[in-house]
Amino acid sequence: HKCDITLQEIIKTLNSLTEQKTLCTELTVTDIFAASKNTTEKETFCRAATVLRQFYSHHEKDTRCLGATAQQFHRHKQLIRFLKRLDRNLWGLAGLNSCPVKEANQSTLENFLERLKTIMREKYSKCSS
């Protein structure tokens, strides 16, 4: 079967997100990948979406993230826009209404996104072969 268009969109968004650092990409998020054994793919996507939603809800108007220059402000706004798009697409892929996220291990947002990108690329290579 062909790869879902949503999956391609997710990878494209993740590529954009991991290209540049902002003042807040080193803030931490719950590392859902640290204990992801016995977790279905759909649960992983759902939890990833939940973590991203928590992040942008909490930091969208964070003064240190918005920065003090026009460039910093623009990059942060772009980051939030991409995270919202990613969140929306992950929910679509997960097909679940909600999922619990235990706040245990921590990861920086940039490491979290890199890990998610690896998972999505692996999924894409499987469905395109």
Partner: nanobody
Framework: EVQLLESGGGLVQPGGSLRLSCAAS????????MGWARQAPGKGLEWVSW????????YYADSVKGRFTISRDNSKNTLYLQMNSLRAEDTAVYYC?????????FGQGTLVTVSS
């Protein structure tokens, strides 16, 4: 366990300088953005400055821009805040901070009093 220990606060005259230090332990310091926040008497917490791990990107509140400089020494696991041209309104408890999930982790703080 994350530990942040601030030092360098004290009493200083208007126009004077102070250098705050924050010794960090319990996590890989070089991987994380770090910052300084302050709380003046009877007021809320205000972000003063933030710096990413490489030190290449920084944020300063408008009230301190041009007077304060944030820096870090990743080999010493230490964060600094150089404060020049201090004003009475800079009087506050200054906290070293790191991100911790949806929250921020703060040290115990160091008091800076600017008075003649």
């Amino acid at each position: 366990e994350v530990q942040l220990l601030e030092s360098g606060g004290g009493l200083v005259q208007p126009g004077g300088s102070l250098r705050l230090s924050c010794a960090a332990s319990g996590f890989t310091f070089r991987n994380f953005g770090m910052g300084w926040a302050r709380q003046a008497p009877g007021k809320g917490l205000e972000w003063v400055s933030w710096i990413i791990s490489s030190g290449t990107e920084t944020y300063y509140a408008d009230s301190v821009k041009g007077r304060f400089t944030i820096s870090r020494d990743n080999s010493k696991n230490t964060l600094y805040l150089q404060m020049n041209s201090l004003r009475a309104e800079d009087t506050a408890v200054y906290y070293c901070a790191k991100s911790l999930g949806r929250f921020d982790y703060f040290g115990q703080g160091t008091l800076v009093t600017v008075s003649s």
